[in-house]
Amino acid sequence: MAVTACQGLGFVVSLIGIAGIIAATCMDQWSTQDLYNNPVTAVFNYQGLWRSCVRESSGFTECRGYFTLLGLPAMLQAVRALMIVGIVLGAIGLLVSIFALKCIRIGSMEDSAKANMTLTSGIMFIVSGLCAIAGVSVFANMLVTNFWMSTANMYTGMGGMVQTVQTRYTFGAALFVGWVAGGLTLIGGVMMCIACRGLAPEETNYKAVSYHASGHSVAYKPGGFKASTGFGSNTKNKKIYDGGARTEDEVQSYPSKHDYV
């Protein structure tokens, strides 16, 4: 039960995280105009990975895509790549983890196969989360560098005659969404990996033997409590008859309403 909960929670957390990574990647507010010097600006600038926008006091917002590929800074390209890799890995991870979920049965899939799939998806989520965190952090570092550079020469112009206030940019909402989303995906991935340990069959797993006890219908299973916990799996046990005790596998074969979260 604990394994199913851990796996299910890991899946949900990762799902939220990947949705957040997608949202952050699509958002326009990766960097926003710093309003420290002019808090009542009539023109507000903000930029995303794919386009830059200008919101006017009048209520009009104009966005223009970056229609060049070669003309863009290498760092921006790197951030784009990291975020896309994160989304792709996360999406594949989600697909794999759906089939790996303990509460979903697909044919006669072995628990060992589910364990492997859970581990694979977990690793994918971890890498996806790291990609998102790395991408956002690289962009944030780029912003900090540019911020202090533009602060150093706040006013530029022709021999100091023309006063041109340089627009400085600070952290936008997308950065925080990206950090949180990356963190959630990472946590979800770790949870999937932890759940995988519980799903994996023991190395020294004995063959279960059924004994007929006289006057009683009892199935005896070597391995003690492992048969009734989620940590040892034995798919080879056959039931004696309906009135007798069932193995763990058989209990799962007839799901009750409590088996679904």
Partner: antibody, heavy 118, light 113 residues
Amino acid sequence: EVQLLESGGGLVQPGGSLRLSCAASEFTFSNYAMSWVRQAPGKGLEWVSTISSGRSSTYYPDSVKGRFTISRDNSKNTLYLQMNSLRAEDTAVYYCAKLGRGNAMEYWGQGTLVTVSS
Amino acid sequence: DIVMTQSPDSLAVSLGERATINCKSSQSLLNSGNQKNYLTWYQQKPGQPPKLLIYWASTRESGVPDRFSGSGSGTDFTLTISSLQAEDVAVYYCQNAYSYPFTFGGGTKLEIK
């Protein structure tokens, strides 16, 4: 055709109050920022206030800050300017204007005259 | 605050001739985000409210005759009437639409010579 009609102007004593209204029609009022601009007799234009489309932001020059309050009622398609502690130098024709692209005041009302005199 | 300075204060031009009005701002009105200059030109005829002519320094408002054109960038701007018509007699104002407080130039009175 966009229409803006100011009202509420008149003669008021120094230190008195007045509330101007601007009724808007033929456009989606709630989507646009609106401004008040004044023009003293024989003088140039002076911006008085701007309010954002969602009522969240209001802007004033130092000359009227703390005395004038801009507001809007999107359900009534009406812009207001509450003027308190009026001075002789506030005497002017007050225009309301709809802001468009480039923060330009693309449509203006005919104006209402406010005279502050004892 | 951004100070807008217009020149000349008044201008007399013959019908059909070119009229040029200048406007200078104390700070740049160029927005780096979209590379547009937030300068607006208005025309005010006697007894009438102002009328928008040009925004973004050079974009003509719809319905404005093409003899009106705006140019300039940063701090120096020009309104040009290529061929003066009798109906162009008015006072022309430039306005900073880049940052609050919005400020207007003192106006240029255009007359027929």
